[in-house]
Interface confidence: medium
């Protein structure tokens, strides 16, 4: 007789992550008896929902229902129909809508309210749509890393799962950039947690972890490149910003009222005698890094050493994990190389910004113009901020490991805010059972 | 045409459950979501939860959130709401109303059932 | 929760008078909002939602008005058949909450 296949015991989780540009939907699969297990959970399936982040559905919440469909539907086709009620669905809100809530605490529990209705009209056992906290945002970034790259499990491997993988328990530093924040969060090495704010402690699998993490609002690449536009635009002497973040020969209006829509550029908002100006590039990596450092205020600092903007960070220690936007853009500039040099990056870039606004749509034509245009002061940015800002140096800059995915599972928060909700990550390590690997008949 | 038709009045002891049914006809069962809202005698209206009935999911008033449980059956298009742990405050009638789902402005109540009364005595 | 606060609690009039009710949220609603009409040992009918749309059926003499966070019910010209206790109802927040009725009297 023929061995009929058992049926596959698993479970599935989903985490829509609802961006400030735009939202993707992550379904996660694991063993149903290897649960507390360390890295058996992984992505099955990502589904970017096309158009922007909800925070732009504000004046048309409406539509949220139609924009969450074609991923809610694709997640009802991955998963097995048998699974449907058992999967749990989570949506996490980050900065786009701490923005929006910072703006109106009315506006964002308004498009809340439309997206838990949305969502809670599928098979799934839906459970909330909320705003994360920076902190929560960080945090979960660290473990889903160090949980991907094995760090939490006690059996050190003989062998490597991934290229920059040591083999030593030490985890991971990580370090997220989104369009309307960044964070960046990792443990210290014997230091002081300054600021309560900054401090984490958590017990996972047996071993207690001091972590540092911070989130900086506004300082995401889309936030800070509004930032630096409403900076700069203060001393232009008319509607003409001749901007060295752009490619030379590249044009583009921008309305003052779409500037100065955003929390994010109050600081430097003035009354203008026009209602519109035309950016105008002239592609200078070095002026360009000059404007994005204003940004940074490193004048004052109440700790014994801080990031910017008076915020503490204590020294760098380990490997870092880049991932979400910092992966993207280097990945777009071919800089993710482990190979490169801070030096060599910087060159690059140099190289990358000077060049003719039109050469570079000739180069890649298949590339959206609004997302083209921007990853001379995205590329210029992170290098800014990674240096300036994190005060990484030319010699710590090969710890610093460029991350798109690990083991097939994409690197950021939203798997780590699933193992924190699903209870999948003990405080204890677990006790192996001699049925856990093998049956015996 | 559209209606809801609920079971019928229960008279129940304290510490006891009541289950009542709304049964749903001239429209499509999923489309809509189901309220249930009680009143007591003399006094106004008050929600005790939700649920999608293409999902099951459900939404509590925080008040009565570990005592009522909302449930359907698809395959009837019938909506049920089970009450434990009656207390005598618990005595009043127990509406079904339907709300549209896709349209925030749908939202509102536009059809309700003739209402259930339960009373809990002892 | 948004807290719906509706007043009078009770009033009496005179057939054909002008009737007015209004319903104030603790936060702006953004016209979300419905209008019902309860007689004794019924259900609630709906007779307005989102603030001024008239259900069909519902004569023209009942009519609605308002915005952000103040809202207006008003009977322009008072019918026996109309005597019965009135409530709003805000569908702003998925946590829908209630007026706490009007009882309208003939006098």
């Known amino acids: 007789t023929q061995n009929k296949a058992l049926p596959e015991n698993v479970k599935y989780g989903i985490v829509l992550d609802a961006g400030s540009s735009h939202t993707s939907l992550y379904i996660y699969k694991w063993p149903a008896e290897k649960e507390n297990d360390t890295g058996v959970v992984h992505q099955v399936e990502e589904c970017r929902v096309k158009g922007p982040g909800i925070s732009k559905f504000v004046q048309k919440v409406n539509e949220i229902g139609i924009y969450l469909t074609d991923c809610m539907e694709r997640a009802r086709e991955v998963i097995p129909r048998s699974q449907h009620q058992e999967t749990p669905v989570y949506l996490g809100a980050t900065a786009g809508m701490r923005l929006l809530r910072m703006e109106s605490e009315e506006l964002a529990d308004r498009v809340l309210d439309v997206v838990e209705r949305s969502l809670s009209n599928y098979p799934f056992d839906f459970q909330g749509a909320r705003i994360i906290t920076g902190q929560e945002e960080g945090a979960y970034g660290w473990i889903t890393i160090n949980y991907l790259l094995g760090k939490f499990s006690q059996k050190t491997r003989w062998f490597s799962i991934v290229p920059y993988e040591t083999n030593n328990q030490e985890t991971f530093g990580a370090l997220d950039l989104g369009g309307a924040s960044t964070q960046v969060t990792f443990v210290p090495q014997n230091q002081t947690i300054e600021s309560p704010d900054n401090a984490l402690q958590f017990r996972l699998y047996g071993k207690d972890y001091n972590v540092y993490t911070h989130s900086f609002l506004c300082y995401g690449k889309d936030q800070a490149l509004w930032q630096k536009l409403a900076k700069d635009i203060q001393v232009a002497s008319n509607e003409i910003l001749r901007d060295p973040c752009f490619h030379p020969g590249y044009k583009k209006v921008v309305n003052v009222s779409d500037l100065y829509k955003t929390p994010c550029t109050k600081r430097f908002e003035m009354t203008l005698p026009f209602q519109q100006f035309e950016i105008q590039g002239i592609g200078n990596y070095q002026q360009c890094h000059q404007s994005i450092l204003e940004l940074f205020n490193t004048s004052y600092c109440p700790y014994s050493q801080c990031a910017f903007n008076g915020i503490f960070l204590p020294p760098l220690q380990g490997d870092f994990g880049a991932f979400s936007a910092f992966y993207f853009v280097m990945k777009f500039l071919n800089l993710t190389s482990e190979k490169v040099s801070q030096e060599k990056v910087t060159e690059m870039m140099k190289k990358f910004c000077a060049q003719p606004w039109e050469e570079i749509k000739t180069s890649y034509a298949g590339v959206k113009e609004k997302y083209l245009s921007e990853y001379c002061f995205s590329g210029t940015y992170i290098l800014s901020l990674l240096l300036q800002g994190y005060h990484f140096t030319a010699d710590s800059w090969e710890h610093i490991h460029f991350i798109g995915k690990i083991q097939g599972s994409d690197a950021g928060w939203t798997l780590g805010y699933m193992l924190n909700l699903t209870n999948m990550i003990p405080a204890e390590q677990p006790l192996s059972t001699p049925l856990s690997h093998s049956t015996y008949v | 045409q559209v209606q809801l038709v609920q079971s019928g009045a229960e008279v129940k002891k304290p510490g006891a459950s009541v289950k009542v049914s709304c049964k749903a006809s001239?429209?499509?069962?999923?489309?809509?979501?189901m309220y249930w809202v009680r009143q007591a005698p003399g006094q106004g209206l008050e929600w005790i939860g939700r649920?999608?009935?293409?999902?099951?999911?459900?939404k509590y008033n925080e008040k009565f959130k570990n005592r009522a449980t909302l449930t359907v059956d698809t395959s009837i298009s019938t909506a049920y709401m089970e009450l434990s742990r009656l207390r005598s405050d618990d005595t009043a009638v127990y509406y079904c109303?339907?709300?549209?789902?896709?349209?925030?402005?749908?939202?509102?109540?536009?059809?309700w059932g003739q209402g259930t009364t339960v009373t809990v005595s002892s | 929760d948004i807290q719906m606060t509706q007043s009078p609690s009770s009033l009496s009039a005179s057939v054909g008078d002008r009737v007015t009710i209004t319903c104030k949220a603790s936060?702006?609603?953004?016209?979300?909002i419905g209008w019902y009409q309860q007689k004794p040992g019924k259900a609630p009918k709906l007779l307005i939602h989102?603030?001024?749309t008239l259900q069909p059926g519902v004569p023209s003499r009942f009519s609605g008005s308002g915005s952000g966070r103040d809202y207006t019910f008003t009977i322009s010209s008072l019918q026996p058949e109309d005597i019965a206790t009135y409530y709003c109802?805000?569908?702003?927040?998925?946590?829908?909450?209630f007026g706490q009725g009007t009882k309208l009297e003939i006098k």
């Open positions: 001239g429209y499509t069962f999923t489309n809509y979501w």
């Open positions: 109802l805000q569908y702003h927040a998925l946590l829908f909450t």
């Open positions: 649920i999608a009935p293409s999902s099951g999911a459900t």
């Open positions: 989102y603030t001024s």
């Open positions: 936060q702006d609603i953004n016209k979300y």
């Open positions: 109303a339907r709300s549209g789902i896709y349209y925030d402005y749908d939202w509102f109540f536009d059809v």
